[in-house]
């Protein structure tokens, strides 16, 4: 909501999760792994990479089925705590200028840092208008105090807020699982919020920094060369 059409393939790590329709976004973090939101779990997922217009075959797409879908073991569907999911692709993505991985964070998100949020979610805060072309939004990371004041009792240490307290610009339904990138690192995963783009209700995002070890351990445990002892 309130964003702009991204320059074509300018977000090469952005993926669309498809189950006959686009239902969530995700981020490519290595040639065979995608990170998304825990609440984007489905038993069958096709990962679509290199997309810009999700309704038109433009020649840069790679459609790869999910081989493994691993939700965080402490995902809470009521609170959306630990809202993170890993998808292993059935075959490695072909990395090129339009499809490439995003780095995991080396430090937690800092208030005031500019970030890029992207997705194919609803562009209306009231009503429904799902775009075909990838939308981008530049937004600042908010302080944890601002975040907690916006959602009293709902924000865990695994969540942070990004956006505008005045409303008007936000992620929305269909953006879940997608990336929040600051300084070339995946800091957040689109998670939840009360409505979209409402005053004093900024978007809430999964704090990827808290899961770097889980991500690395899970990838290691689910790689072909892993041996059990």
């Amino acid at each position: 909501v309130g964003g702009y059409i991204c320059e074509e393939n300018s977000v090469p790590y952005q993926v669309s999760l498809n189950s006959g329709y686009h239902f969530c976004g995700g981020s490519l973090i290595s040639e065979q792994w995608v990170v998304s939101a825990g609440h984007c779990y489905k038993s069958r997922i096709q990962v679509r990479l290199g997309e810009h217009n999700i309704e038109v075959l433009e020649g840069n797409e790679q459609f790869i089925n999910a081989a493994k879908i691993i939700r965080h073991p402490k995902y809470n569907s009521r609170t959306l705590d630990n809202d993170i999911l890993l998808i292993k692709l059935s075959s490695p993505a072909v990395i090129n200028s339009r499809v490439s991985a995003i780095s995991l964070p080396t430090a937690p998100p800092a208030a005031g840092t500019e970030s890029l949020i992207s997705g194919w979610g609803n562009t209306l805060s009231s009503g429904a208008d799902y775009p075909d072309e990838l939308q981008c939004l530049d937004a600042p990371v908010l302080s944890q105090a601002e975040c907690e004041a916006s959602y009293p009792g709902k924000i865990t240490n695994n969540m942070f807020c990004v956006g505008f307290l005045e409303g008007g610009k936000d992620s929305c339904q269909g953006d879940a699982g997608g990336p929040v990138v600051s300084n070339g690192e995946l800091q957040g995963i689109v998670s939840w919020g009360y409505g979209c783009a409402q005053k004093n209700r900024p978007g809430v995002y999964t704090k990827v920094y808290n899961y770097v070890d889980w991500i690395k351990d899970t990838i290691a445990a689910n790689s072909h060369h892993h041996h059990h002892h």
Epitope: A37, H39, G121, G127, Q173, W192
Partner: antibody, heavy 125, light 107 residues
């Protein structure tokens, strides 16, 4: 395979209550929601309400507000629909059906992919 | 509430015919529409979801199209087992609403 199995037919008097059960199997119960739909004899489909199996959030049809309660028991993967103060025009086949959760910022798509076999409820004095 | 208007309410057709059923929403619902088939005494069965995606196991003679307010279900070559009642359903927002149904009968 994925299936929803409903409780058996009921005959009730006007003013009574009925509680229909819907037992799910073949999938993780809390990853989906359950809708309830009824069909009066010779009529079309009427949506009654929806319940999230993971959060127990509900959304009821306005015309049934105050008379219907939907619940789930995650330990047995069973959904329940109770309808109170029954009237003769509540005579219908009642169906449960599986649909996507409405949660977070995932695309909301509230179609129904798997249906129970139906439970006939007859309200007659 | 979003009203769903289906037409025609009934259609007589022969085996091998092409049958088209339309559904109109009272306001835009993007692609969030489903089509169901129901035979007498049976539960509805999902045919098409998200306007045009074919449900697993459903024959390819069934297809769906449309976006916004106008949607179509097409049976390219009617088979004996296709004689049934068909319903559309908007899957965009609560309350969920169904069309009135279209009965496909043998001519």
């Amino acid at each position: 395979q994925v299936q929803l199995v409903q409780s058996g037919a009921e005959v009730k008097k006007p003013g009574a209550s009925v509680k229909v059960s819907c037992k799910a199997s073949g999938y993780t119960f809390t990853d989906y929601a359950i809708s309830w739909v009824r069909q009066a004899p010779g009529q079309g489909l009427e949506w009654m309400g929806w319940i999230s199996a993971s959060t127990a959030d509900t959304n009821y049809a306005q015309k049934l507000q105050g008379r219907v309660t939907m619940t789930t028991d995650t330990s047995t993967s069973t959904a329940y629909m109770e309808l109170r103060s029954l009237r003769s025009d509540d005579t219908a086949v009642y169906y449960c059906a599986r649909g996507d959760e409405v949660v977070g910022k995932r695309t909301y798509y509230i179609g129904m992919d798997v249906w129970g076999q139906g439970t006939t409820v007859t309200v007659s004095s | 509430d979003i009203q769903m208007t289906q037409s025609p309410s009934s259609v007589s057709a022969s085996v091998g015919d092409r049958v088209t059923i339309t559904c109109r929403a009272s306001q835009g619902i993007s692609r969030w529409l489903a089509w169901y088939q129901q035979k007498p005494g049976k539960a509805p069965k999902l045919l098409i979801y998200a306007a045009s995606s074919l449900q697993s196991g459903v024959p390819s003679r069934f297809s769906g199209s449309g976006s916004g307010t106008d949607f179509t279900l097409t049976i390219s070559s009617l088979q004996p087992e296709d004689f049934a009642t068909y319903y559309c359903q908007q899957a965009n927002s609560f309350p969920i609403t169904f069309g009135g149904g279209t009965k496909v009968e043998i001519k």
